[in-house]
Interface confidence: low
């Protein structure tokens, strides 16, 4: 999905009002310095691409993020403020339902959510437009 045409300010507002708090809740009890940020992004469409990948694509050691509160709110924000996003996610959602796993917070998941926090913060920086 190409995130270029999303309403970035509305997504930013959704992040600031709720998603950020849900990410903090998920990370509660973890020191902010515990994980190094290794995933990066440089503009808003790129940041959303990385955020979507880390939030919804199962990875080795962390398969359960998509059912977390912050993930559901992220999905809702993208569906509302990114034209055509919902349609691209139908097949992915159906595939995900077939292999639902037991919800467990692993250290790998905590590390992944720490990366997400960094990506979201980068998303919120003032955007430089191509001139």
């Amino acid at each position: 999905y190409d995130f270029t045409n999303c309403d970035f300010e509305k997504i930013k507002a959704a992040y600031l009002s709720t998603i950020s708090k849900d990410l903090i809740t998920y990370m509660s009890g973890t020191k902010s310095t515990e994980f190094n940020n290794t995933v990066s992004c440089s503009n808003r469409p790129h940041c959303l691409t990385e955020i979507q990948s880390l939030t919804f694509n199962p990875t080795a050691g962390c398969a359960s993020l998509a059912k977390e509160m912050f993930a559901m709110k992220t999905k809702a924000a993208l569906a509302i403020w990114c034209p055509g996003y919902s349609e691209t996610q139908i097949n992915a959602t159906q595939a995900m339902k077939k292999r639902r796993k037991r919800k467990v917070t692993t250290n790998k998941c905590l590390e992944q959510v720490s990366q997400l926090q960094g990506l979201w913060r980068r998303f919120n920086r003032p955007l430089l437009k191509q001139q």
Epitope: S40, C41, S42, N43, R121, P126
Partner: antibody
Framework: EVQLVQSGAEVKKPGASVKVSCKAS????????MNWVRQAPGQRLEWMGI????????SYNQKFKGRVTLTVDKSASTAYMELSSLRSEDTAVYYC??????????????WGQGTTVTVSS | EIVLTQSPATLSLSPGERATLSCRAS?????MHWYQQKPGQAPRPWIY???NLASGVPARFSGSGSGTSYTLTISRLEPEDFAVYYC????????FGGGTKVEIK
């Protein structure tokens, strides 16, 4: 180790242009913004502009708009600042400075050594 | 454009004294960064995002403030602290204050 190495000193005549380079190493060049800041002798720091090496997006200080052009060569991990229609008051040290995310703010955490540009007839 | 005004322009103090540097913004900003510069050198990041000391900065330095008013404080001046300090914001276009020179009295 992050390093920003700038090109050498330049002496230019009024009306000419100057192009200063800033070679980055020790990090992924496209991950962070690059600022350009200048400082005339005995004067304050003056922000000129910023570029995203990822997409070439730029933002300029209105004072320099139309005279300054920021570009990057991603393959060479190098940022460039070109200033045209030089005048004597452009005599200054020109710095490139990486801007990274840290502590909930975007700060200029690594600076080049500076390039002295002298404009004189 | 947000204008940053630093005061005083020059602060003449003796080693061991307390230094208070002020930076005022023409409109509210989220946070303020501070840089130290010594003659012939590039600026060095000193305090990130209002109150976080950069790597290697001694604990005698502290930063505080919010909105339009920010402060850098040096609890007890050491000889190596005498330098020029600049505040900087990055809320919209980036911008620096005019600097405060901390000199030996």
């Amino acid at each position: 180790e992050v390093q920003l190495v700038q090109s050498g000193a330049e002496v230019k005549k009024p009306g000419a242009s100057v192009k200063v380079s800033c070679k980055a190493s020790g990090y992924t060049f496209t991950d962070d913004y690059m600022n350009w800041v200048r400082q005339a002798p005995g004067q304050r720091l003056e922000w000129m502009g910023i570029i995203s090496p990822y997409n070439g997006g730029t933002s300029y200080n209105q004072k320099f708009k139309g005279r300054v052009t920021l570009t990057v060569d991603k393959s060479a991990s190098t940022a460039y600042m070109e200033l045209s229609s030089l005048r004597s008051e452009d005599t200054a040290v020109y710095y490139c400075a990486r801007e990274d995310y840290d502590y909930d703010g975007y700060a200029m955490d690594y600076w080049g050594q500076g390039t002295t540009v002298t404009v004189s007839s | 454009e947000i204008v940053l005004t630093q005061s005083p322009a020059t602060l003449s103090l003796s080693p061991g004294e307390r230094a208070t540097l002020s930076c005022r913004a023409s409109s509210s900003v989220s946070y303020m960064h501070w840089y130290q510069q010594k003659p012939g050198q590039a600026p060095r990041p000193w305090i990130y995002a209002t109150s976080n000391l950069a790597s290697g900065v001694p604990a005698r330095f502290s930063g505080s403030g919010s909105g339009t008013s920010y402060t850098l404080t040096i609890s007890r001046l050491e000889p190596e602290d005498f330098a020029v300090y600049y505040c900087q914001q990055s809320d919209n276009v980036r911008g620096f204050g005019g600097g405060t020179k901390v000199e030996i009295k």
